[in-house]
Structures are given as structure tokens and as C-alpha cells.
Interface confidence: medium
């Protein structure tokens, strides 16, 4: 992927809207939308006052760890759906899109240098462990996906792209 493709706001916007769409199709869906197990996902809460003052490398650690856990969670959701007796087609479509979207975002972040950033800060080893929550429905899973992209990922790429422009 071109190194700064993710710095084009339209690129991230596409994934944000996909994530929101996925969340919207699960609104009011109970029958098809239970995961039947608790899946660990990243806690997406952002204290923006503190985040704004965090080293970009520390932000990268949080984003990279969160993205890895979220990808794992969505893949687990996909597996559960495949194994269910009658997967609901719209849900299947959005889960597949989320899996593909997270793969692409991982590639785009790697191209931006997020992985290097996440390894290089001296305090990376002593960084606080990633806060997690659990999701037991696809609605919650998609909500976390949407929140993660809208929050930490967008805030980090905005900062990393600005830093790279200097």
C-alpha cells in the first residue's frame, strides 16, 4: 500500500461508513444477532484530554494492540456465523466486509509505519495493558468496530499524518 494512503480522509471515511452500516443492520436484531459466547474486544473509550498529550508512539501501541484484538474478535464472529445453522445473509455480508476492512486497515497502518512506531518508544514495554470489554452480540461487536475506527484509529492517523507532513 502507498505509505500515506490512509492520510487521504476519503479512505478512512469508507471504512467508517461501512462500520456504521454494519452496526445499523443489527439494530433491533435479536434472533440472528447473538454471538452465543462472550468475545473479548478492546475498550474503545478515549479520554481525549490525555490522548492529545500522549506520544504518537504510545498512541500507536494502543491502536496496534486494539486492531489486533478487534481483528481476532471479528474473525471469531465470522467463524461462529459460518457454523450457525442458518446464517442471516445481510449479517454475513457485513461480517465479511469487516474482516476484509480490518485486513486492509492493518496493511494501511503498517505502510504508515504504525508498527514501527509501536515498537520503538522506550516506554512501550512498560505501557499499561490494553483495556478490554466483552461483546455477546454482533451489534456490540460492530459498535466496538465502529467506535474504534471513529475514535483511536482516526485520532492516531490524524496525528501521525500531521507529524509526517512536518
Amino acid at each position: 500500500a502507498p505509505p500515506r494512503l490512509i492520510c487521504d480522509s476519503r479512505v478512512l471515511e469508507r471504512y467508517l461508513l461501512e462500520a456504521k452500516e454494519a452496526e445499523n443492520i443489527t439494530t433491533g436484531c435479536a434472533e440472528h444477532c447473538s454471538l452465543n459466547e462472550n468475545i473479548t474486544v478492546p475498550d474503545t473509550k478515549v479520554n481525549f484530554y490525555a490522548w492529545k498529550r500522549m506520544e504518537v508512539g504510545q498512541q500507536a501501541v494502543e491502536v496496534w494492540q486494539g486492531l489486533a484484538l478487534l481483528s481476532e474478535a471479528v474473525l471469531r464472529g465470522q467463524a461462529l456465523l459460518v457454523n450457525s445453522s442458518q446464517p442471516w445473509e445481510p449479517l454475513q455480508l457485513h461480517v465479511d466486509k469487516a474482516v476484509s476492512g480490518l485486513r486492509s486497515l492493518t496493511t494501511l497502518l503498517r505502510a504508515l509505519g504504525a508498527q514501527k512506531e509501536a515498537i520503538s518508544p522506550p516506554d512501550a514495554a512498560s505501557a499499561a495493558p490494553l483495556r478490554t470489554i466483552t461483546a455477546d452480540t454482533f451489534r456490540k461487536l460492530f459498535r466496538v468496530y465502529s467506535n474504534f475506527l471513529r475514535g483511536k484509529l482516526k485520532l492516531y492517523t490524524g496525528e501521525a499524518c500531521r507529524t509526517g507532513d512536518r
Epitope: Y49, K140, G151
Partner: antibody
């Protein structure tokens, strides 16, 4: 039940400063950021800035940068907003609002509001 | 910085449905919150994250966000719903909370 009690109305001269207080009760003070929002007579809401009591980090809207200082005193569960170099356009009701993470939000929203403090700037 | 545009006023008869709009560039990309403010009172959060209702807010209040417009819908409007309504987003490019200009809802 969360309550935010603000200091009383103030009349100030142009060029002077005003410091408005906001005392919180109910819930843990340090767990939630406090924002300050103002509303000029007959006008809309305008975010001025806010503070995270845990870190003491404050952030300000561009428009007020350099003129506003937001602080928090954990021992008294009170947040303060000081606005300097006052001019007549600063005549407004100043609200403090406590931010809260609702289920499923990545960012806290302004869930609880004080009743507001009217600041009148007049010579 | 980001701009949210609301109509200055909306009028509706009691029992009917009121729709208050809030437009901005790529607004579906943002999460929109709505506040109600009655004369002489502090604002009250009525919808957060596009379409979620805080506890204590009647089901008559709902929200949506698609196209280039976020909408606050109040069904079966009552006289007590007469107030100013403000939309709000967090604009992370400027790291600021942004409010719309407000819409005065009049119940005829």
C-alpha cells in the same frame, strides 16, 4: 444523583477577569471531565474548553486560547473557568457540564449541566 | 473548523411529528448528539450517538444520521416539547466540540 452547583451572577468591567466555579456532588469527581459552554443572550451554545481532573490536562477552543484558563481542585470537587480581558461580547450565561461515557460511546458526552452563571460585562 | 447547520425554526401541531435537521460535510461519519433547552434552563441531552436515548427521555424522541443530514424526530409532539434543540459533534481534526446554531421548536 450528580449535581453541579455554579457560583452566582457577576457584573464586570471591560478589561477585567472573571472566575466562575462549578462544584460537583454525586459520583467520583476525578473520573469525569468537565466542559465549559457559554451562551450569549439569544444566541446558541459555544464550547469554550474542558478539563480532565485525573491528569489536570485542560483543552481550549481556538477562539478562547490565551484568554481562558480552566482548572480543577480535587479536594473540593470544584472546577473553575477564568476568562480574562473581558469585553462586552463576553456577556453570556456560562455553563459547566460533566462528561459521561454512555454505554457504547467512545467519547464522553455532556450528560449533566449546571444551572449557569450570568456574567455581564459593562462599563 | 467543522460547521453544523440547523434551520432556525420548526413549527408543528400537537400530536404530529416534528423533524429537526442538522447538516454538515460527511456528517454520517460523525456521531451526533442532541440537546433540548427550554427557556431559562440548562440544556438536557435527549439523544446521543445518533440514535441512543438516555434513561428518562421518552421514546417519542429518536435520531438518525444518513446522507448529509442528521435528524431529530419527535413523534406525538406535546406542548412541553417546545424548546430550542441543538445538535453537537466532536470534531477530532480541531479537537473541539461543535454545536449547531440551534432550532426553535414551536408547538402551534
Amino acid at each position: 444523583q450528580v449535581q453541579l452547583v455554579q457560583s452566582g451572577a457577576e457584573v464586570k468591567k471591560p478589561g477585567s477577569s472573571v472566575k466562575v466555579s462549578c462544584k460537583a456532588s454525586g459520583g467520583t469527581f476525578r473520573s469525569y471531565a468537565i466542559s465549559w459552554v457559554r451562551q450569549a443572550p439569544g444566541q446558541g451554545l459555544e464550547w469554550m474548553g474542558g478539563i480532565d481532573p485525573i491528569s489536570g490536562f485542560a483543552d481550549y477552543a481556538q477562539k478562547f486560547q490565551g484568554r481562558v484558563t480552566i482548572t480543577a481542585d480535587e479536594s473540593t470537587s470544584t472546577a473553575y473557568m477564568e476568562l480574562s480581558s473581558l469585553r462586552s461580547e463576553d456577556t453570556a450565561v456560562y455553563y459547566c457540564a460533566r462528561e459521561l461515557y454512555y454505554p457504547g460511546t467512545w467519547m464522553a458526552v455532556m450528560a449533566y449541566w449546571g444551572r449557569g452563571t450570568l456574567v455581564t460585562v459593562s462599563s | 473548523s467543522y460547521v453544523l447547520t440547523q434551520p432556525p425554526s420548526v413549527s408543528v401541531a400537537p400530536g404530529k411529528t416534528a423533524r429537526i435537521t442538522c447538516s454538515g460535510d460527511n456528517i454520517p461519519e460523525y456521531y451526533v448528539h442532541w440537546y433540548q433547552q427550554k427557556p431559562g434552563q440548562a440544556p438536557v441531552l435527549v439523544i446521543y450517538r445518533d440514535n441512543e436515548r438516555p434513561s428518562g427521555i421518552p421514546e417519542r424522541f429518536s435520531g438518525s444520521n444518513s446522507g448529509n443530514t442528521a435528524t431529530l424526530t419527535i413523534s406525538r409532539v406535546e406542548a412541553g416539547d417546545e424548546a430550542d434543540y441543538y445538535c453537537q459533534v466532536f470534531d477530532e481534526s480541531s479537537w473541539h466540540w461543535v454545536f449547531g446554531g440551534g432550532t426553535k421548536l414551536t408547538v402551534l
